[in-house]
Amino acid sequence: GSTVPPMVNVTRSEASEGNITVTCRASSFYPRNIILTWRQDGVSLSHDTQQWGDVLPDGNGTYQTWVATRICRGEEQRFTCYMEHSGNHSTHPVPSGNSHHHHHHHH
């Protein structure tokens, strides 16, 4: 089938005192090969500090996955979710407060 770019959605939730968990979800993409990673200052975080979900079919002939990490509250501006899919890439910031951002990638 033809390439379908992912919808990328970044959310945050309270973790422990002074920390938040940030989650980057990519959905509705095809083909299934994708790179999703959290970055600090533009540098990919170490493997051990991130948790990845499996790349799974979402029932529409496309796929979904996620990556999460825990960061210090107040340092959100240093962190971005980086996505690569079918030769295209994009970066997605941590939203302020409890809001979330989501959009299709166009690059």
């Epitope: 990673t37 600090q40 200052d41 540098v43 990919s44 170490s46 051990d48 501006q77 980086y82």
Partner: antibody, heavy 116, light 107 residues
Framework: VQLQESGPGLVKPSQSLSLTCNVT?????????WNWIRQFPGNKLEWIGY???????TYNPSLKSRVSITRDTSKNQFFLQLNSVTPEDTATYYC??????????WGLGTSVTVSS | DIQMTQTPSSLSASLGDRVTISCRAN??????LNWYQQKPDGAVKLLIY???RIHSGVPSRFSGSGSGTDYSLTIANLEQEDVATYFC?????????FGGGTKVEIK
């Protein structure tokens, strides 16, 4: 993207070493981390630290007490200051951009000798 | 700090030869392994990032592989312009650290 290091080639022991990295072709406030690395005689490479596009800094713990990396966004430059130098700080100093997993662009390096 | 051991420290090969350089970490670095080329004039270029991804503009005769603690760089068809010193770098666990280098010469 091009990076170019500059600074004095000779520094006296106990003084401070100050170097400049001039970046062209990409804004240092756009993205990525802007690094200093040094190469000792004999080829050993050591990462010194970086200043990120937001202005946040991260240093090698082995040098943290002596190092400061700053920037001038109006000139698209970033700087290294290494205090209380000794002859063991004699090296070629490189600046480089760290993009995602790797340092994809490097300067040509500038040689610094610490000697009285 | 993670220690990176590169072997051999130097090698001499004929034009057209297949050359392999090894890099071993003293703990798992989860594919966060890069290879750089340093020409005799000191200029440093990225060749391979994240174990096996070829940086833009790098000839296809360069390839990388490995996992866990053991990684390698292969030059499939040695050319005169490949005379240089090659370094590996781990980026998984701060601070990032480099191998000691492998000097490649032509017989």
């Amino acid at each position: 993207v091009q990076l170019q290091e500059s600074g004095p080639g000779l520094v006296k022991p106990s003084q401070s070493l100050s170097l400049t990295c001039n970046v062209t072709g990409y804004s240092i406030t756009g993205d990525y981390a802007w690094n200093w690395i040094r190469q000792f005689p004999g080829n050993k490479l050591e990462w010194i630290g970086y200043i990120g596009y937001t202005g946040s800094t991260t240093y090698n713990p082995s040098l943290k007490s002596r190092v400061s990396i700053t920037r001038d966004t109006s000139k698209n430059q970033f700087f290294l200051q290494l205090n209380s130098v000794t002859p063991e700080d004699t090296a070629t100093y490189y600046c480089a951009r760290w993009r995602n997993w790797a340092m994809d662009y490097w300067g040509l390096g500038t040689s610094v000798t610490v000697s009285s | 700090d993670i220690q990176m051991t590169q072997t051999p420290s130097s090698l001499s090969a004929s034009l057209g030869d297949r050359v392999t350089i090894s890099c071993r970490a003293n703990q798992d670095i989860s594919h966060y392994l890069n290879w750089y080329q340093q020409k005799p004039d000191g200029a440093v270029k990225l060749l391979i990032y994240y174990t096996s991804r070829i940086h833009s503009g790098v000839p296809s005769r360069f390839s990388g592989s490995g996992s866990g603690t053991d990684y390698s760089l292969t030059i499939a068809n040695l050319e005169q312009e490949d005379v240089a010193t090659y370094f590996c770098q781990q980026g998984n666990t701060p601070p990032t650290t480099f191998g000691g280098g492998t000097k490649v010469e032509i017989k």
